[in-house]
Protein backbone atom coordinates (compact mmCIF):
# COMPACT_ATOMS: atom_id res chain seq x y z
CA UNK A 1 0.00 0.00 0.00
CA UNK A 2 1.08 3.56 -0.54
CA UNK A 3 0.22 6.99 -1.91
CA UNK A 4 0.84 8.66 -5.27
CA UNK A 5 1.36 12.37 -4.70
CA UNK A 6 1.00 15.14 -7.27
CA UNK A 7 2.09 18.72 -6.71
CA UNK A 8 0.91 21.30 -9.26
CA UNK A 9 3.45 24.13 -9.56
CA UNK A 10 1.85 26.32 -12.20
CA UNK A 11 -0.86 26.45 -14.83
CA UNK A 12 -0.74 29.25 -17.37
CA UNK A 13 -0.05 30.22 -20.97
CA UNK A 14 2.70 28.23 -22.64
CA UNK A 15 5.61 29.87 -24.45
CA UNK A 16 5.25 31.08 -28.01
CA UNK A 17 2.57 33.01 -29.86
CA UNK A 18 -1.17 32.64 -29.46
CA UNK A 19 -1.52 33.22 -25.72
CA UNK A 20 -4.87 31.83 -24.53
CA UNK A 21 -7.65 34.10 -23.39
CA UNK A 22 -8.06 34.24 -19.65
CA UNK A 23 -10.64 31.66 -18.57
CA UNK A 24 -12.19 34.10 -16.10
CA UNK A 25 -13.64 37.55 -16.53
CA UNK A 26 -15.11 40.32 -14.41
CA UNK A 27 -18.56 39.11 -15.51
CA UNK A 28 -17.67 35.47 -14.86
CA UNK A 29 -15.09 35.11 -12.09
CA UNK A 30 -13.85 31.58 -11.72
CA UNK A 31 -11.48 29.30 -9.90
CA UNK A 32 -9.49 26.26 -10.89
CA UNK A 33 -9.35 22.74 -9.63
CA UNK A 34 -7.51 19.67 -10.83
CA UNK A 35 -8.38 16.03 -11.32
CA UNK A 36 -5.82 13.25 -11.63
CA UNK A 37 -6.57 9.77 -12.91
CA UNK A 38 -4.06 6.91 -12.70
CA UNK A 39 -4.05 3.63 -14.58
CA UNK A 40 -1.55 0.78 -14.21
CA UNK A 41 0.87 -0.07 -17.01
CA UNK A 42 1.64 1.89 -20.11
CA UNK A 43 -1.89 1.62 -21.41
CA UNK A 44 -3.23 4.07 -23.96
CA UNK A 45 -6.76 3.67 -22.72
CA UNK A 46 -9.47 6.14 -23.57
CA UNK A 47 -9.88 9.02 -21.16
CA UNK A 48 -13.21 7.65 -19.99
CA UNK A 49 -11.92 4.19 -19.05
CA UNK A 50 -11.74 3.55 -15.28
CA UNK A 51 -8.93 5.03 -13.23
CA UNK A 52 -7.95 1.57 -12.02
CA UNK A 53 -5.08 2.82 -9.83
CA UNK A 54 -7.22 5.57 -8.38
CA UNK A 55 -8.23 9.18 -8.90
CA UNK A 56 -8.26 12.37 -6.88
CA UNK A 57 -9.81 15.80 -7.05
CA UNK A 58 -8.01 18.87 -5.69
CA UNK A 59 -9.54 21.57 -3.55
CA UNK A 60 -10.82 24.66 -5.36
CA UNK A 61 -8.24 27.38 -6.00
CA UNK A 62 -8.67 31.04 -5.06
CA UNK A 63 -11.28 33.02 -6.99
CA UNK A 64 -9.71 34.78 -9.96
CA UNK A 65 -11.04 37.70 -11.98
CA UNK A 66 -9.29 38.76 -15.16
CA UNK A 67 -7.78 42.23 -15.24
CA UNK A 68 -9.14 43.86 -18.44
CA UNK A 69 -6.55 44.02 -21.20
CA UNK A 70 -3.99 41.93 -19.31
CA UNK A 71 -2.76 38.65 -20.82
CA UNK A 72 -3.68 35.48 -18.96
CA UNK A 73 -1.07 35.06 -16.23
CA UNK A 74 -0.28 31.88 -14.34
CA UNK A 75 -3.59 31.23 -12.62
CA UNK A 76 -3.95 30.93 -8.83
CA UNK A 77 -3.77 27.32 -7.73
CA UNK A 78 -5.40 25.26 -5.00
CA UNK A 79 -3.30 24.56 -1.92
CA UNK A 80 -1.84 21.18 -1.11
CA UNK A 81 -1.06 17.94 -2.86
CA UNK A 82 -3.35 15.67 -4.80
CA UNK A 83 -3.04 12.28 -3.16
CA UNK A 84 -4.12 9.00 -4.73
CA UNK A 85 -3.87 6.11 -2.27
CA UNK A 86 -3.19 2.66 -3.73
CA UNK A 87 -4.01 -0.50 -1.79
CA UNK A 88 -1.93 -3.06 -3.63
CA UNK A 89 1.57 -3.06 -5.05
CA UNK A 90 2.79 0.02 -6.93
CA UNK A 91 3.01 -1.14 -10.57
CA UNK A 92 6.19 0.76 -11.49
CA UNK A 93 4.78 1.80 -14.87
CA UNK A 94 1.62 3.89 -14.99
CA UNK A 95 -0.45 6.20 -17.18
CA UNK A 96 -1.77 9.49 -15.89
CA UNK A 97 -4.37 12.03 -16.95
CA UNK A 98 -4.33 15.45 -15.30
CA UNK A 99 -7.31 17.68 -16.02
CA UNK A 100 -7.57 21.38 -15.25
CA UNK A 101 -11.14 22.37 -14.54
CA UNK A 102 -12.72 25.81 -14.37
CA UNK A 103 -15.55 26.50 -11.96
CA UNK A 104 -17.57 29.52 -13.10
CA UNK A 105 -18.88 31.57 -10.23
CA UNK A 106 -21.36 33.79 -12.06
CA UNK A 107 -24.89 34.08 -10.79
CA UNK A 108 -26.04 30.75 -12.18
CA UNK A 109 -29.22 29.86 -10.38
CA UNK A 110 -28.53 26.16 -10.72
CA UNK A 111 -25.19 26.46 -8.97
CA UNK A 112 -21.74 26.81 -10.53
CA UNK A 113 -20.91 25.52 -14.00
CA UNK A 114 -17.84 23.38 -14.61
CA UNK A 115 -15.88 23.07 -17.81
CA UNK A 116 -12.64 21.39 -18.76
CA UNK A 117 -9.87 23.85 -19.61
CA UNK A 118 -7.06 21.45 -20.41
CA UNK A 119 -6.14 17.79 -20.24
CA UNK A 120 -2.64 16.36 -20.30
CA UNK A 121 -1.77 12.70 -20.34
CA UNK A 122 1.39 10.65 -20.26
CA UNK A 123 2.98 7.33 -19.49
CA UNK A 124 5.85 7.03 -17.06
CA UNK A 125 8.07 4.61 -15.17
CA UNK A 126 8.40 5.42 -11.49
CA UNK A 127 9.78 3.48 -8.55
CA UNK A 128 8.07 3.97 -5.22
CA UNK A 129 10.24 5.60 -2.58
CA UNK A 130 12.19 7.65 -5.13
CA UNK A 131 12.58 11.45 -5.27
CA UNK A 132 10.04 13.86 -6.74
CA UNK A 133 9.97 13.72 -10.56
CA UNK A 134 9.39 17.06 -12.32
CA UNK A 135 7.37 17.36 -15.51
CA UNK A 136 6.05 19.98 -17.93
CA UNK A 137 3.13 19.17 -20.20
CA UNK A 138 1.36 21.32 -22.78
CA UNK A 139 -2.29 21.23 -23.76
CA UNK A 140 -3.00 23.59 -26.63
CA UNK A 141 -1.83 27.04 -25.58
CA UNK A 142 -1.73 26.10 -21.88
CA UNK A 143 1.26 24.76 -19.94
CA UNK A 144 1.12 22.70 -16.74
CA UNK A 145 4.17 22.27 -14.50
CA UNK A 146 4.02 19.61 -11.83
CA UNK A 147 5.95 17.09 -9.75
CA UNK A 148 4.96 13.62 -8.64
CA UNK A 149 6.19 10.69 -6.58
CA UNK A 150 4.96 7.41 -5.16
CA UNK A 151 5.69 6.59 -1.55
CA UNK A 152 4.94 3.51 0.47
CA UNK A 153 2.85 3.62 3.61
CA UNK A 154 4.50 1.89 6.59
CA UNK A 155 5.09 -0.95 7.09
CA UNK A 156 5.49 -1.40 3.31
CA UNK A 157 8.82 -0.59 1.64
CA UNK A 158 10.56 -1.21 -1.66
CA UNK A 159 10.11 0.03 -5.20
CA UNK A 160 6.71 -1.66 -5.40
CA UNK A 161 5.70 -1.27 -1.72
CA UNK A 162 5.39 -5.05 -1.44
CA UNK A 163 8.09 -5.69 1.19
CA UNK A 164 7.03 -5.15 4.76
CA UNK A 165 9.25 -3.93 7.54
CA UNK A 166 8.93 -3.96 11.30
CA UNK A 167 11.27 -2.54 13.97
CA UNK A 168 13.73 -5.17 15.21
CA UNK A 169 12.68 -7.12 18.23
CA UNK A 170 16.28 -7.87 19.12
CA UNK A 171 19.00 -5.22 18.85
CA UNK A 172 21.45 -7.32 16.84
CA UNK A 173 19.61 -9.42 14.31
CA UNK A 174 16.32 -10.24 12.62
CA UNK A 175 14.21 -13.24 13.42
CA UNK A 176 14.65 -16.64 11.76
CA UNK A 177 14.32 -16.47 7.98
CA UNK A 178 13.88 -12.69 7.94
CA UNK A 179 16.41 -10.32 6.35
CA UNK A 180 17.32 -6.76 7.34
CA UNK A 181 15.19 -4.22 5.53
CA UNK A 182 17.41 -2.14 3.24
CA UNK A 183 17.65 0.82 3.33
CA UNK A 184 16.21 0.72 6.86
CA UNK A 185 18.90 -1.51 8.33
CA UNK A 186 17.51 -1.10 11.84
CA UNK A 187 14.28 -2.77 10.67
CA UNK A 188 13.54 -6.29 9.58
CA UNK A 189 11.41 -7.77 6.83
CA UNK A 190 8.12 -8.75 8.38
CA UNK A 191 6.16 -11.89 7.64
CA UNK A 192 3.72 -11.47 4.77
CA UNK A 193 0.53 -9.63 5.58
CA UNK A 194 -2.39 -11.47 4.01
CA UNK A 195 -5.53 -9.87 2.66
CA UNK A 196 -7.35 -7.84 5.32
CA UNK A 197 -9.80 -10.06 7.14
CA UNK A 198 -8.26 -13.33 5.93
CA UNK A 199 -9.03 -15.97 8.54
CA UNK A 200 -5.89 -16.61 10.63
CA UNK A 201 -7.08 -20.18 11.36
CA UNK A 202 -8.28 -21.27 7.92
CA UNK A 203 -6.38 -19.01 5.49
CA UNK A 204 -2.77 -18.33 4.52
CA UNK A 205 -0.89 -16.37 1.83
CA UNK A 206 2.20 -16.58 -0.33
CA UNK A 207 1.89 -13.05 -1.70
CA UNK A 208 0.93 -9.92 0.21
CA UNK A 209 -2.79 -9.26 0.06
CA UNK A 210 -3.87 -12.75 -0.97
CA UNK A 211 -5.95 -15.21 1.02
CA UNK A 212 -5.72 -18.89 0.16
CA UNK A 213 -7.91 -21.37 1.98
CA UNK A 214 -7.02 -24.55 3.81
CA UNK A 215 -8.99 -27.61 2.76
CA UNK A 216 -12.57 -27.51 4.00
CA UNK A 217 -12.87 -23.71 3.86
CA UNK A 218 -13.90 -21.32 1.10
CA UNK A 219 -14.87 -17.72 0.39
CA UNK A 220 -12.62 -14.71 -0.25
CA UNK A 221 -11.60 -14.64 3.43
CA UNK A 222 -11.70 -18.42 4.02
CA UNK A 223 -14.47 -17.97 6.57
CA UNK A 224 -17.13 -20.16 4.90
CA UNK A 225 -17.03 -23.86 5.71
CA UNK A 226 -17.37 -26.18 2.75
CA UNK A 227 -20.65 -27.99 3.48
CA UNK A 228 -20.54 -31.75 4.04
CA UNK A 229 -23.46 -33.56 2.50
CA UNK A 230 -24.31 -37.14 1.70
CA UNK A 231 -23.69 -38.02 -1.88
CA UNK A 232 -23.58 -41.20 -3.88
CA UNK A 233 -20.23 -42.88 -4.24
CA UNK A 234 -19.20 -43.29 -7.85
CA UNK A 235 -18.82 -47.03 -7.18
CA UNK A 236 -22.52 -47.71 -7.64
CA UNK A 237 -25.81 -47.77 -5.84
CA UNK A 238 -24.97 -50.81 -3.71
CA UNK A 239 -22.11 -49.00 -1.99
CA UNK A 240 -22.59 -47.13 1.20
CA UNK A 241 -22.80 -43.36 0.86
CA UNK A 242 -19.73 -41.40 1.87
CA UNK A 243 -19.35 -37.81 2.98
CA UNK A 244 -18.18 -35.47 0.20
CA UNK A 245 -17.23 -31.81 0.13
CA UNK A 246 -19.50 -29.43 -1.73
CA UNK A 247 -18.62 -25.75 -1.67
CA UNK A 248 -21.29 -23.83 0.20
CA UNK A 249 -22.62 -20.66 -1.42
CA UNK A 250 -20.77 -17.62 -0.01
CA UNK A 251 -22.57 -14.29 0.30
CA UNK A 252 -20.12 -12.78 -2.21
CA UNK A 253 -20.52 -15.55 -4.80
CA UNK A 254 -21.37 -14.02 -8.16
CA UNK A 255 -20.37 -10.60 -6.73
CA UNK A 256 -23.60 -8.87 -5.73
CA UNK A 257 -21.89 -5.45 -5.95
CA UNK A 258 -22.76 -3.52 -9.11
CA UNK A 259 -20.76 -0.88 -11.00
CA UNK A 260 -17.35 -2.29 -10.16
CA UNK A 261 -17.89 -2.47 -6.40
CA UNK A 262 -15.85 -5.02 -4.48
CA UNK A 263 -17.53 -7.47 -2.14
CA UNK A 264 -16.28 -8.48 1.28
CA UNK A 265 -17.95 -10.92 3.62
CA UNK A 266 -19.22 -9.87 7.02
CA UNK A 267 -20.21 -12.23 9.83
CA UNK A 268 -23.86 -11.86 8.87
CA UNK A 269 -23.85 -11.05 5.16
CA UNK A 270 -21.65 -9.00 2.80
CA UNK A 271 -20.52 -5.44 2.32
CA UNK A 272 -19.85 -3.57 -0.93
CA UNK A 273 -17.03 -1.07 -1.23
CA UNK A 274 -18.27 1.22 -3.99
CA UNK A 275 -16.17 3.15 -6.49
CA UNK A 276 -16.43 6.93 -6.54
CA UNK A 277 -19.76 8.07 -7.89
CA UNK A 278 -21.80 5.09 -6.64
CA UNK A 279 -23.47 4.24 -3.37
CA UNK A 280 -26.18 2.03 -1.91
CA UNK A 281 -26.12 -1.51 -0.47
CA UNK A 282 -24.98 -2.97 -3.82
CA UNK A 283 -23.42 0.22 -5.33
CA UNK A 284 -26.50 0.36 -7.51
CA UNK A 285 -27.14 4.08 -7.01
CA UNK A 286 -25.21 6.48 -9.21
CA UNK A 287 -24.29 9.61 -7.32
CA UNK A 288 -22.22 11.26 -10.03
CA UNK A 289 -22.71 15.03 -10.05
CA UNK A 290 -20.98 17.87 -11.82
CA UNK A 291 -18.58 18.11 -8.88
CA UNK A 292 -17.09 14.80 -10.03
CA UNK A 293 -16.12 16.40 -13.34
CA UNK A 294 -17.84 13.83 -15.55
CA UNK A 295 -17.72 15.75 -18.86
CA UNK A 296 -14.72 15.21 -21.14
CA UNK A 297 -13.24 17.18 -24.02
CA UNK A 298 -14.34 20.61 -22.83
CA UNK A 299 -17.95 19.59 -22.25
CA UNK A 300 -19.87 21.89 -19.93
CA UNK A 301 -21.58 20.17 -17.02
CA UNK A 302 -25.18 21.08 -16.22
CA UNK A 303 -26.74 19.84 -12.98
CA UNK A 304 -27.17 20.37 -9.28
CA UNK A 305 -24.81 19.58 -6.41
CA UNK A 306 -27.09 17.12 -4.61
CA UNK A 307 -26.06 13.45 -5.08
CA UNK A 308 -29.57 12.73 -6.36
CA UNK A 309 -29.29 15.43 -9.03
CA UNK A 310 -29.00 14.42 -12.65
CA UNK A 311 -26.30 15.92 -14.84
CA UNK A 312 -25.88 16.37 -18.56
CA UNK A 313 -22.84 17.39 -20.55
CA UNK A 314 -23.19 20.15 -23.12
CA UNK A 315 -20.67 18.97 -25.71
CA UNK A 316 -18.45 21.10 -27.94
CA UNK A 317 -18.61 20.56 -31.70
CA UNK A 318 -17.01 17.30 -32.76
CA UNK A 319 -17.86 15.33 -29.60
CA UNK A 320 -20.84 13.28 -28.50
CA UNK A 321 -21.84 10.70 -25.89
CA UNK A 322 -23.36 11.27 -22.47
CA UNK A 323 -19.97 12.53 -21.25
CA UNK A 324 -18.74 14.06 -24.55
CA UNK A 325 -16.30 11.17 -24.59
CA UNK A 326 -16.72 10.15 -28.24
CA UNK A 327 -15.09 12.02 -31.08
CA UNK A 328 -17.45 12.40 -34.01
CA UNK A 329 -16.04 11.76 -37.46
CA UNK A 330 -18.43 14.23 -39.01
CA UNK A 331 -16.88 13.81 -42.45
CA UNK A 332 -17.94 10.14 -42.50
CA UNK A 333 -21.50 11.38 -43.09
CA UNK A 334 -20.22 12.89 -46.39
CA UNK A 335 -21.83 16.27 -45.82
CA UNK A 336 -20.06 17.96 -48.76
CA UNK A 337 -21.98 17.59 -51.98
CA UNK A 338 -20.89 17.62 -55.61
CA UNK A 339 -17.49 16.10 -54.86
CA UNK A 340 -16.47 18.74 -52.29
CA UNK A 341 -13.62 17.92 -49.90
CA UNK A 342 -14.66 17.66 -46.22
CA UNK A 343 -12.44 19.19 -43.51
CA UNK A 344 -13.26 18.63 -39.82
CA UNK A 345 -11.61 21.54 -38.03
CA UNK A 346 -12.82 20.44 -34.58
CA UNK A 347 -14.74 23.63 -33.87
CA UNK A 348 -16.41 23.58 -37.27
CA UNK A 349 -16.90 21.63 -40.45
CA UNK A 350 -15.70 23.07 -43.76
CA UNK A 351 -16.26 21.98 -47.32
CA UNK A 352 -13.73 22.82 -50.00
CA UNK A 353 -15.81 22.97 -53.18
CA UNK A 354 -14.84 21.95 -56.69
CA UNK A 355 -14.85 24.62 -59.38
CA UNK A 356 -18.38 25.59 -60.31
CA UNK A 357 -19.91 24.84 -56.90
CA UNK A 358 -20.38 26.97 -53.80
CA UNK A 359 -22.21 27.14 -50.48
CA UNK A 360 -21.43 25.77 -46.98
CA UNK A 361 -21.95 22.21 -48.27
CA UNK A 362 -21.10 22.91 -51.98
CA UNK A 363 -24.81 22.57 -52.64
CA UNK A 364 -25.07 25.45 -55.11
CA UNK A 365 -24.27 24.70 -58.74
CA UNK A 366 -22.92 27.93 -60.12
CA UNK A 367 -24.25 28.92 -63.56
CA UNK A 368 -20.92 28.51 -65.29
CA UNK A 369 -21.94 30.65 -68.25
CA UNK A 370 -23.50 33.44 -66.18
CA UNK A 371 -21.63 36.62 -66.97
CA UNK A 372 -19.17 34.70 -69.13
CA UNK A 373 -19.68 35.92 -72.70
CA UNK A 374 -17.88 34.16 -75.51
CA UNK A 375 -16.52 36.73 -77.99
CA UNK A 376 -16.79 36.84 -81.75
CA UNK A 377 -20.05 34.93 -81.97
CA UNK A 378 -18.92 31.95 -79.86
CA UNK A 379 -21.45 30.08 -77.71
CA UNK A 380 -20.96 29.11 -74.03
CA UNK A 381 -21.22 25.42 -73.12
CA UNK A 382 -21.62 24.39 -69.44
CA UNK A 383 -19.96 21.27 -68.20
CA UNK A 384 -18.85 19.76 -64.87
CA UNK A 385 -18.46 23.01 -63.00
CA UNK A 386 -16.44 24.75 -65.69
CA UNK A 387 -17.44 26.64 -68.79
CA UNK A 388 -15.97 26.53 -72.27
CA UNK A 389 -16.67 28.39 -75.47
CA UNK A 390 -17.51 26.78 -78.75
CA UNK A 391 -15.95 29.33 -81.08
CA UNK A 392 -17.09 30.52 -84.49
CA UNK A 393 -14.92 29.63 -87.44
CA UNK A 394 -11.67 31.55 -87.45
CA UNK A 395 -11.56 32.16 -83.68
CA UNK A 396 -10.17 30.21 -80.74
CA UNK A 397 -8.95 30.43 -77.15
CA UNK A 398 -10.89 30.16 -73.87
CA UNK A 399 -13.21 33.08 -74.71
CA UNK A 400 -12.91 33.02 -78.55
CA UNK A 401 -10.94 36.25 -78.37
CA UNK A 402 -7.96 34.91 -80.28
CA UNK A 403 -8.04 34.97 -84.06
CA UNK A 404 -7.37 31.41 -85.03
CA UNK A 405 -4.65 30.51 -87.53
CA UNK A 406 -6.37 27.66 -89.32
CA UNK A 407 -3.07 26.52 -90.80
CA UNK A 408 -1.28 26.20 -87.45
CA UNK A 409 -2.19 22.52 -87.13
CA UNK A 410 -0.78 21.71 -90.62
CA UNK A 411 -4.02 20.33 -91.89
CA UNK A 412 -2.98 19.69 -95.52
CA UNK A 413 -1.68 16.16 -96.14
CA UNK A 414 0.97 14.90 -98.54
CA UNK A 415 2.89 18.19 -98.67
CA UNK A 416 -0.10 20.31 -99.60
CA UNK A 417 0.23 24.03 -98.94
CA UNK A 418 -2.20 25.71 -96.56
CA UNK A 419 -3.74 29.13 -97.17
CA UNK A 420 -5.79 30.99 -94.59
CA UNK A 421 -9.05 32.17 -96.08
CA UNK A 422 -11.78 34.41 -94.61
CA UNK A 423 -14.09 31.42 -94.29
CA UNK A 424 -11.55 28.86 -93.15
CA UNK A 425 -8.55 27.35 -94.92
CA UNK A 426 -7.67 26.17 -98.41
CA UNK A 427 -5.20 23.42 -99.25
CA UNK A 428 -3.16 23.60 -102.46
CA UNK A 429 -2.34 19.94 -103.07
CA UNK A 430 0.93 18.62 -104.37
CA UNK A 431 0.78 16.93 -107.77
CA UNK A 432 -0.91 13.54 -107.58
CA UNK A 433 -3.17 14.41 -104.62
CA UNK A 434 -6.58 15.87 -104.27
CA UNK A 435 -9.35 16.42 -101.70
CA UNK A 436 -10.13 19.12 -99.16
CA UNK A 437 -7.06 18.12 -97.17
CA UNK A 438 -5.12 16.58 -100.09
CA UNK A 439 -5.85 13.25 -98.56
CA UNK A 440 -6.65 11.27 -101.72
CA UNK A 441 -4.11 10.13 -104.34
CA UNK A 442 -5.31 11.05 -107.81
CA UNK A 443 -4.40 7.65 -109.30
CA UNK A 444 -4.34 5.10 -106.61
CA UNK A 445 -3.67 1.92 -108.76
CA UNK A 446 -3.42 3.92 -111.95
CA UNK A 447 -7.10 5.00 -111.96
CA UNK A 448 -8.79 7.99 -110.46
CA UNK A 449 -10.49 7.11 -107.19
CA UNK A 450 -12.78 10.08 -107.52
CA UNK A 451 -15.21 11.25 -110.09
CA UNK A 452 -13.97 13.75 -112.61
CA UNK A 453 -13.15 17.12 -111.15
CA UNK A 454 -16.04 19.51 -111.24
CA UNK A 455 -16.09 22.01 -114.06
CA UNK A 456 -13.57 24.81 -113.65
CA UNK A 457 -11.34 22.81 -111.26
CA UNK A 458 -8.42 20.85 -112.53
CA UNK A 459 -6.71 18.25 -110.39
CA UNK A 460 -3.96 20.08 -108.52
CA UNK A 461 -6.00 23.28 -108.20
CA UNK A 462 -6.48 24.50 -104.64
CA UNK A 463 -9.55 22.91 -103.04
CA UNK A 464 -11.46 25.13 -100.70
CA UNK A 465 -12.60 23.48 -97.44
CA UNK A 466 -16.04 24.67 -96.67
Amino acid sequence: AGVFELQIHSFGPGPGPGAPRSPCSARLPCRLFFRVCLKPGLSEEAAESPCALGAALSARGPVYTEQPGAPAPDLPLPDGLLQVPFRDAWPGTFSFIIETWREELGDQIGGPAWSLLARVAGRRRLAAGGPWARDIQRAGAWELRFSYRARCEPPAVGTACTRLCRPRSAPSRCGPGLRPCAPLEDECEAPLVCRAGCSPEHGFCEQPGECRCLEGWTGPLCTVPVSTSSCLSPRGPSSATTGCLVPGPGPCDGNPCANGGSCSETPRSFECTCPRGFYGLRCEVSGVTCADGPCFNGGLCVGGADPDSAYICHCPPGFQGSNCEKRVDRCSLQPCRNGGLCLDLGHALRCRCRAGFAGPRCEHDLDDCAGRACANGGTCVEGGGAHRCSCALGFGGRDCRERADPCAARPCAHGGRCYAHFSGLVCACAPGYMGARCEFPVHPDGASALPAAPPGLRPGDPQRYL
Epitope: Q108, L300, V302, C313, H314, C315, F319, Q320, G321, S322
Partner: nanobody, 115 residues
Protein backbone atom coordinates in the same frame (compact mmCIF):
# COMPACT_ATOMS: atom_id res chain seq x y z
CA UNK B 1 -35.06 39.44 -22.93
CA UNK B 2 -36.39 36.09 -24.18
CA UNK B 3 -37.89 34.04 -21.36
CA UNK B 4 -38.91 30.44 -21.04
CA UNK B 5 -42.50 29.87 -19.91
CA UNK B 6 -43.59 26.70 -18.14
CA UNK B 7 -47.12 25.34 -17.92
CA UNK B 8 -48.88 22.20 -16.71
CA UNK B 9 -48.16 22.43 -12.98
CA UNK B 10 -50.86 21.96 -10.38
CA UNK B 11 -52.10 19.81 -7.54
CA UNK B 12 -52.31 16.06 -7.92
CA UNK B 13 -52.82 13.04 -5.66
CA UNK B 14 -50.03 10.51 -4.98
CA UNK B 15 -49.78 8.06 -7.86
CA UNK B 16 -51.19 10.65 -10.28
CA UNK B 17 -49.64 12.12 -13.43
CA UNK B 18 -48.86 15.55 -14.84
CA UNK B 19 -47.27 16.80 -18.03
CA UNK B 20 -45.20 19.97 -17.89
CA UNK B 21 -44.52 21.99 -21.04
CA UNK B 22 -41.96 24.70 -21.70
CA UNK B 23 -42.30 26.94 -24.71
CA UNK B 24 -42.78 27.32 -27.56
CA UNK B 25 -39.64 29.45 -27.59
CA UNK B 26 -36.90 30.08 -30.14
CA UNK B 27 -34.46 29.26 -27.32
CA UNK B 28 -35.43 25.59 -27.39
CA UNK B 29 -33.43 24.40 -30.38
CA UNK B 30 -31.52 21.21 -30.99
CA UNK B 31 -28.13 22.91 -30.46
CA UNK B 32 -29.03 23.73 -26.84
CA UNK B 33 -28.89 21.47 -23.80
CA UNK B 34 -32.24 21.60 -22.03
CA UNK B 35 -33.69 20.26 -18.84
CA UNK B 36 -36.05 20.50 -15.90
CA UNK B 37 -34.78 21.57 -12.48
CA UNK B 38 -36.84 21.46 -9.33
CA UNK B 39 -36.53 23.19 -5.99
CA UNK B 40 -38.41 22.13 -2.89
CA UNK B 41 -38.72 24.62 0.00
CA UNK B 42 -35.45 24.93 1.86
CA UNK B 43 -33.62 22.67 -0.60
CA UNK B 44 -31.12 23.21 -3.39
CA UNK B 45 -32.23 23.48 -6.99
CA UNK B 46 -31.37 20.19 -8.72
CA UNK B 47 -31.64 18.82 -12.23
CA UNK B 48 -34.47 16.30 -12.48
CA UNK B 49 -34.01 15.40 -16.14
CA UNK B 50 -32.02 16.77 -19.04
CA UNK B 51 -31.30 16.32 -22.73
CA UNK B 52 -27.87 17.38 -23.95
CA UNK B 53 -27.16 19.13 -27.24
CA UNK B 54 -25.97 15.76 -28.60
CA UNK B 55 -29.17 13.99 -27.57
CA UNK B 56 -28.08 12.18 -24.37
CA UNK B 57 -30.73 12.08 -21.65
CA UNK B 58 -30.20 11.67 -17.93
CA UNK B 59 -32.50 11.53 -14.92
CA UNK B 60 -32.12 12.02 -11.19
CA UNK B 61 -32.02 8.64 -9.47
CA UNK B 62 -35.25 9.35 -7.58
CA UNK B 63 -37.33 9.87 -10.76
CA UNK B 64 -35.91 7.19 -13.06
CA UNK B 65 -38.69 5.07 -14.52
CA UNK B 66 -41.37 7.57 -13.48
CA UNK B 67 -40.49 10.75 -15.39
CA UNK B 68 -39.80 11.12 -19.13
CA UNK B 69 -38.23 14.18 -20.72
CA UNK B 70 -38.72 14.93 -24.41
CA UNK B 71 -38.33 17.81 -26.81
CA UNK B 72 -40.12 18.72 -30.01
CA UNK B 73 -37.64 20.70 -32.09
CA UNK B 74 -40.25 21.47 -34.74
CA UNK B 75 -42.45 23.09 -32.08
CA UNK B 76 -39.52 24.48 -30.06
CA UNK B 77 -41.06 22.95 -26.93
CA UNK B 78 -39.72 20.88 -24.02
CA UNK B 79 -41.87 18.43 -22.03
CA UNK B 80 -41.69 16.51 -18.77
CA UNK B 81 -44.14 13.64 -18.37
CA UNK B 82 -44.43 12.81 -14.66
CA UNK B 83 -46.24 9.69 -13.47
CA UNK B 84 -46.51 7.73 -10.19
CA UNK B 85 -46.05 11.06 -8.41
CA UNK B 86 -45.04 11.05 -4.75
CA UNK B 87 -45.23 13.61 -1.97
CA UNK B 88 -41.48 14.17 -2.25
CA UNK B 89 -41.93 15.34 -5.86
CA UNK B 90 -43.62 18.49 -4.56
CA UNK B 91 -41.51 21.44 -5.74
CA UNK B 92 -41.30 24.36 -8.13
CA UNK B 93 -40.20 22.99 -11.52
CA UNK B 94 -38.05 25.22 -13.71
CA UNK B 95 -37.42 24.90 -17.43
CA UNK B 96 -33.76 25.43 -18.39
CA UNK B 97 -31.72 25.77 -21.57
CA UNK B 98 -28.11 26.59 -22.27
CA UNK B 99 -25.45 26.83 -24.92
CA UNK B 100 -21.76 27.60 -24.33
CA UNK B 101 -22.37 31.30 -23.89
CA UNK B 102 -25.70 31.69 -22.13
CA UNK B 103 -28.18 29.97 -19.89
CA UNK B 104 -31.92 30.58 -19.79
CA UNK B 105 -34.48 29.92 -17.06
CA UNK B 106 -38.23 29.90 -16.80
CA UNK B 107 -40.04 31.49 -13.86
CA UNK B 108 -41.15 28.07 -12.56
CA UNK B 109 -44.40 26.15 -12.17
CA UNK B 110 -45.54 24.64 -8.88
CA UNK B 111 -46.28 20.92 -8.62
CA UNK B 112 -48.01 19.81 -5.41
CA UNK B 113 -48.54 16.15 -4.60
CA UNK B 114 -50.85 15.60 -1.63
CA UNK B 115 -53.58 13.14 -0.67
Amino acid sequence: EVQLVESGGGEVQPGGSLRLSCGPSEIITSDKSVGWYRQAPGKQRNLVAGISNVGSTNYAQSVKGRFTISRDNAKNTLYLQMSSLRAEDTAVYYCYARDFENEYWGQGTLVTVKP
